[in-house]
């Protein structure tokens, strides 16, 4: 007996599509072997129509596809534009057509429902609106107009021109009689339900001279679009429900049991806790379309999602909807990276951001997720030298270590820095990762003075104290600018006396600025790294002033002006060009998410990843 399983009979009608799922034991060999769909011939052979290796028969060109879902042990054959010629016996199978690892499927395509003569067919999606047009003759212009639905053998009145409305249609149906010039009345039914489908009869007049018109209403439940994304990657659901619901609340929900569809996010401000920090509902266009980005995909995110429109912001009978079946591939190409990074007030974090290594030249971005309204992610820094004004001197995006990872360093941490941040590029939109920064109790490991004043023409020496835990790390000083942090020469001055219970392995490393000039003013960082992997940093602002008295300045910790997190740097906003915001590849299809407060800073939306690992501020 073959271990392959599928539908034994599939019945459909001309013009329709079918989606045939075949199940196989998900062994390693089966997952990677050839999958096929073939038609059985009269003499026993089986002619391949489509396979997972890219073959598509000319009979199926442009109307069929085969998708393998290895972690589920299934593959799906979609066939569109069915005709009666497609009726027959088929096999779905693995390996070679003749080897027996297959399942027999009978496909029967019929002409479609038998319709009465002169029947107009209306095919409308669930939740949408249909207008049934009913012509009549002049002699019936003043007579009663009505619409009936055929239930079994009996016509049941749905609506008439005297004001009657069947209770099943209350609040969503109307009968319009056109102006005197047109011999036509229309019945408009909104928020269509599956139960509305069937045969209708519209009638003008009640006697033997009445005018009658038959209508067949087909209400289509949307077939879920199959979406297949990698664990830790991201998915974008594009929802286009039509301009008629442009002003109605929108939602994305995930079906749990039965008809229950738990709201993931909606335009009324609701958001499921499981998606905190990793979801954006992008503002809708005038036509009512919108998109939802979910990043840091988890195994448990797999399932059936619906987007829709309803004033309640959740699924109701008659909501227009779109559907997706999301599969999350656990054999992910996106590497694990910490989803939580911890730092202390006044300290720093170094965040590693993965990107698609084939896109090393792409622009890298980092943004801060904000949960207000539908979620937004204003940009903080990019790899082209732009840094949001409030972050000058304490934020840097480094291309290192490269080969699929870049680094973001944020120092002078305060409790306000706690939150979710997204890493992204203007390349592969699936590679978006989220990291949560948590501010925990503790003291910064690196000790530097507060803000320092240097004197023009003199020498300035700034100390940085490294505890013994960093004895094996490379220690450096650098000068911050908006493209990175340029390394400077520094002197190891031996063990530091700034640490209690710390042996000879602690270090005092000084930065010396000889013959200070105005150009030396700015932010300086001392830090530790191992190769291209960065650890903690500490920042000092050096101001430059005119000479008052001769001599050089040697700054000690005792001369610090203020704690690093108390520094307020008043340097005006830099207005960035819209080209960065509107780069069409930045979100592929997503739009920038902005509000007026951050227009000058170029707010842009962004990204996520998911693993349960945590990373401390000083770890790699």
């Amino acid at each position: 007996k073959s271990p392959i399983f599928g539908p034994e009979e599939v019945n459909s009608v001309e013009g329709n599509s079918v989606s045939i799922t075949c199940y196989y034991p998900p062994t390693s060999v089966n997952r990677h072997t050839r999958k096929y769909w073939c038609r059985q011939g009269a003499r026993g052979g089986c002619i391949t129509l489509i396979s997972s290796e890219g073959y598509v028969s000319s009979k199926y060109a442009g109307r069929a596809n085969l998708t393998n879902f290895p972690e589920n042990g299934t593959f799906v054959v979609n066939i569109a534009q069915l005709s009666q010629d497609d009726s027959g016996r088929y096999k779905c199978g693995l390996g070679i057509n003749s080897r027996g690892l297959s399942f027999d499927v009978s496909l029967e395509v019929s002409q479609g429902p038998g319709l009465l003569n002169d029947t107009k067919v209306y095919t409308v999606d669930l939740g949408r609106t249909v207008t049934i047009n009913c012509p009549f003759k002049t002699e019936n212009a003043q007579k009663r107009k009505s619409l009936y639905k055929q239930i079994g053998l009996y016509p049941v009145l749905v609506i008439d021109s005297s004001g009657y409305v069947n209770p099943n249609y209350t609040g969503r149906i109307r009968l319009d009689i056109q102006g005197t010039g047109q011999l036509l009345f229309s019945v408009v039914i909104n928020q269509l339900r599956l139960s509305d489908a069937g045969q209708y009869l519209c009638q003008a007049g009640d006697d033997s001279n009445s005018n009658k018109k038959n209508a067949d209403l087909q209400v289509l439940k949307p077939e879920p679009e199959l979406v297949y994304e990698d664990l830790r990657g991201s998915v974008t659901f594009h929802c286009a429900l039509g301009p008629e619901v442009a002003n109605v609340a929108k939602f994305l929900c995930r079906q749990s049991s039965g008809e229950n569809c738990d709201v993931v996010v909606n335009t009324l401000g609701k958001r499921a806790p499981a998606f905190e920090g990793r979801i954006l509902l992008n503002p809708q266009d005038k036509d009512g379309s919108f998109s939802v980005v979910i990043t840091g995909l988890r195994k448990e995110d797999a399932g059936r999602y619906l987007c829709g429109a309803h004033s309640d912001g959740q699924l109701q009978e008659g909501s227009p909807i779109q559907a997706w079946q999301l599969f999350v591939n656990e054999e992910s190409t996106i590497p694990r990276s910490p989803t939580v990074v911890k730092g202390v007030a006044g300290g720093s974090v170094a965040v590693l951001c993965p990107y698609n290594r084939k896109e090393s030249k792409s622009i890298k971005y980092w943004c801060l997720w904000e949960g207000a309204q539908n979620g937004r992610c204003p940009l903080l820094v990019d790899s082209e030298g732009w840094v949001k004004a409030q972050y000058e001197g304490r934020l840097s995006l480094l291309e290192e270590p490269g080969n699929g990872t870049f680094t973001v360093i944020l120092n002078q941490l305060t409790s306000r820095d706690a939150g979710f941040y997204w890493c992204l590029t203007n390349g592969d939109t699936l590679w978006r990762t989220t990291v949560e920064i948590k501010i925990i109790e503790g003291e910064p490991n690196l000790k530097v003075p507060g803000n320092v004043t240097a004197v023009l023409g003199e020498t300035l020496k700034v100390p940085c104290h490294f505890p013994c835990k960093f004895s094996s790390y490379e220690k450096y000083w650098c000068k911050w600018n908006n493209t990175g942090c340029q390394a400077l020469p520094s002197q190891d001055e031996g063990p530091s006396k700034a640490f209690v219970n710390c042996d000879e392995n602690s270090r005092l490393v000084s930065l010396t600025l000889n013959l200070v000039t105005r150009a030396d003013e700015g932010w300086y960082w001392c830090g530790v790294k191992q190769g291209h992997f960065y650890g903690e940093t500490a920042a000092v602002y050096v101001a430059v002033e005119e000479r008052k008295a001769a001599g050089s300045r040697d700054v000690s910790l005792a001369k610090a002006d203020a704690a690093p997190d108390e520094k307020v740097l008043d340097s005006g906003f830099r207005e960035i060009e819209n080209k960065a915001i509107q780069d069409p590849r930045l979100f592929a299809e997503e739009k920038a998410v902005a509000d007026t407060r951050d227009q000058a800073d170029g707010s842009r939306a962004s990204v996520d990843s998911g693993s349960s690992e945590e990373q401390g501020g000083s770890s790699r």
């Epitope: 539908p7 599939v10 599509s17 079918v18 199940y23 589920n72 299934t74």
Partner: nanobody
Framework: QVQLVESGGGLVQAGDSLRLSCAAS????????MGWFRQPPGKEREFVAT??????????YYADSVKGRFTISRDNAKNTVYLQMNSLKPEDTAVYYC?????????????????WGQGTQVTVSS
């Protein structure tokens, strides 16, 4: 909620036929997968047949043990699914359950179904 009520079970001789019905009521507007499972005495619940539909397309799935003998069908107007059982064998003796769901990843897996009926007894004597 969706309520499922099975009927049509009974005691028959081997080789006879029976037709089981499962009537669905309640909010059935999104339910489009309905199946039959059975639980023989002292055994686990097992898959028998499933019918699923989308628009005017219908998919029918059968267990190997009933292929060619059992037929699953539906009547949308009555919200009812039927299981026509021909050439019954003593090993078909079981409590037959109707199950329904909006979507199932694998129609053979009982845990994929959200709603269940109370069951109807089918006994086939030799």
């Amino acid at each position: 909620q969706v309520q499922l009520v099975e009927s049509g079970g009974g005691l028959v001789q081997a080789g006879d036929s029976l037709r089981l019905s499962c009537a669905a009521s309640g909010r059935t507007f999104t339910t489009y997968v309905m199946g039959w499972f059975r639980q023989p005495p002292g055994k686990e619940r097992e898959f028998v047949a499933t019918i699923s539909w989308s628009g005017s397309t219908t998919y029918k799935y059968y267990a190997d043990s009933v292929k060619g003998r059992f037929t699953i069908s539906r009547d949308n107007a009555k919200n009812t699914v039927y299981l026509q059982m021909n050439s019954l064998k003593p090993e078909d003796t079981a409590v037959y359950y109707c199950a329904a769901s909006t979507v199932v990843a694998d129609p053979r897996a009982p845990n994929e179904y959200d709603y269940w009926g109370q069951g109807t007894q089918v006994t086939v004597s030799s």
